[in-house]
Amino acid sequence: IWELKKDVYVVELDWYPDAPGEMVVLTCDTPEEDGITWTLDQSSEVLGSGKTLTIQVKEFGDAGQYTCHKGGEVLSHSLLLLHKKEDGIWSTDILKDQKEPKNKTFLRCEAKNYSGRFTCWWLTTISTDLTFSVKSSRGSSDPQGVTCGAATLSAERVRGDNKEYEYSVECQEDSACPAAEESLPIEVMVDAVHKLKYENYTSSFFIRDIIKPDPPKNLQLKPLKNSRQVEVSWEYPDTWSTPHSYFSLTFCVQVQGKSKREKKDRVFTDKTSATVICRKNASISVRAQDRYYSSSWSEWASVPCS
Amino acid sequence: RNLPVATPDPGMFPCLHHSQNLLRAVSNMLQKARQTLEFYPCTSEEIDHEDITKDKTSTVEACLPLELTKNESCLNSRETSFITNGSCLASRKTSFMMALCLSSIYEDLKMYQVEFKTMNAKLLMDPKRQIFLDQNMLAVIDELMQALNFNSETVPQKSSLEEPDFYKTKIKLCILLHAFRIRAVTIDRVMSYLNAS
């Protein structure tokens, strides 16, 4: 058993048939010695009396908020949560496996630049009685500070018969130098509590590997005289690291017909303009990627040819 | 990815082209190592990230863009010693910080060159003959060093009398290539920045 936060404890349980469970001794936080009674989860039914209460925790129903009272007055609370281990593996029932980029990916993170700011998100089908708490650091043995905000519900989607909820959190490395060469990864730890179930999820990454620039901005077309060609121009996204001559991007320009089956013409360039042939009903799209370290491409910025 | 390769203008900052070649060569070598050594811990997640230049050179600090010198977090250990210009500074008025930056890059290359050559000598003794260093990568390191043209004492190649542990050598190769790729990215950023300014 260990303390998650003040008055909240996690009991780690090996889950198998006939498992003996974990014996937990709760002590009432009071100088009082006599006349103390114990109740569980808002019930007025008395479970036991005395300064300590011994319980055998075997399953979720044995957890909950234990309260000690004296003469109708609440003295202290202890909330017990369960962390379930089956076949040596901690349960991952609360979050959905996103399976990208690999199986058992519960947390996904992205950064728009090298400022040390990043966003992580996760998915669940659970809609109520759910809380998350996020901690992060650079490295684990001698951790350096990363500050994370509160996790918030950022999107809801319908998937077949199920509703899916996306939560996200923003974190910022306390003292980040955009030009630094990372040798220790960022560690992100998410504590998830659903009803009386506790689970934890972790992710480890270098900012350089989770970079995904915003799409190029101000995408414009300029027709060239007496030609089907157009000059496409764009700018670096506002959120990209500066100076741009140091944090350079490379771009992919694509001409796409109305039908998905039509052949796509693609040009790669380090410049912020390109000359392409604009077909009728086609659209021109541009996306960006770090020029020197091939992490993710941005989403496309698009304009119609007409 | 196969991007069109720009050929540099004669008047262009001479080292930019070499640094682009360097990044391409080390990235290819790393990809080859990952594929060839697929049953070794050779991915970014699996290896220990070591920097052989740590405490010996200060490339990131010395080559910091002016715009980032206001960032407290980037100024932990900036050194300000004066080093004479190399040929990449061709006819440019440059601050001593730029000279320090380029000499720091030169020292990095020299250190990695020695490590890679020593390692290659060991790999050539491996009866499995599983992996060797790409001669192109070693040549590109050499070309960039020549373009930087800093006079510095030659470091003798390390020789070892004991029987090499090939498993350890291959893991060390992965560690070295990952670190060198990160440094090559920094070098490319620096050259691009210097070229623009």
Partner: nanobody, 124 residues
Framework: EVQLVESGGGLVQPGGSLRLSCAAS????????MGWFRQAPGKGLEFVAV????????YYAESVKGRFTISKDSSKNTVYLQMNSLRAEDTAVYYC?????????????????WGQGTQVTVSS
């Protein structure tokens, strides 16, 4: 999902005893409490007894206190209701139910899963 199957009901004389069983299957580890409720002819659903977890707490309706005992065999995922000193007013269909709710475990509206019921008749 949790499936519940009751057994053990029947006809018994006043003062007699019966033991009801409720076998749970499916995602039983999600349940917080299991309880027994009853419905007499022409009456509403009434709380009888509930067991929390593996038996850390048990709650009883005033009308059955001292006569009925609820227990659980966690290894078999089975809850029992031992009914002694049965009276005519105990005649009803007895339902086993399971809840994933922490609170109001004596309130049938908080229960998620129900068995099909077993008839108990107390008559001479």
């Amino acid at each position: 999902e949790v499936q519940l199957v009751e057994s053990g009901g029947g006809l018994v004389q006043p003062g007699g005893s019966l033991r009801l069983s409720c076998a749970a299957s499916g995602r039983t580890f999600e349940t917080i409490a299991m309880g027994w409720f009853r419905q007499a002819p022409g009456k509403g659903l009434e709380f009888v007894a509930v067991i929390r977890g593996s038996g850390v707490a048990t709650y009883y309706a005033e009308s059955v206190k001292g006569r009925f005992t609820i227990s659980k065999d966690s290894s078999k995922n089975t809850v029992y209701l031992q009914m002694n000193s049965l009276r005519a007013e105990d005649t009803a269909v007895y339902y086993c139910a399971a809840t994933t709710n922490r609170f109001k475990n004596t309130d049938y509206t908080t229960y998620d899963y129900w068995g099909q019921g077993t008839q108990v008749t107390v008559s001479s």
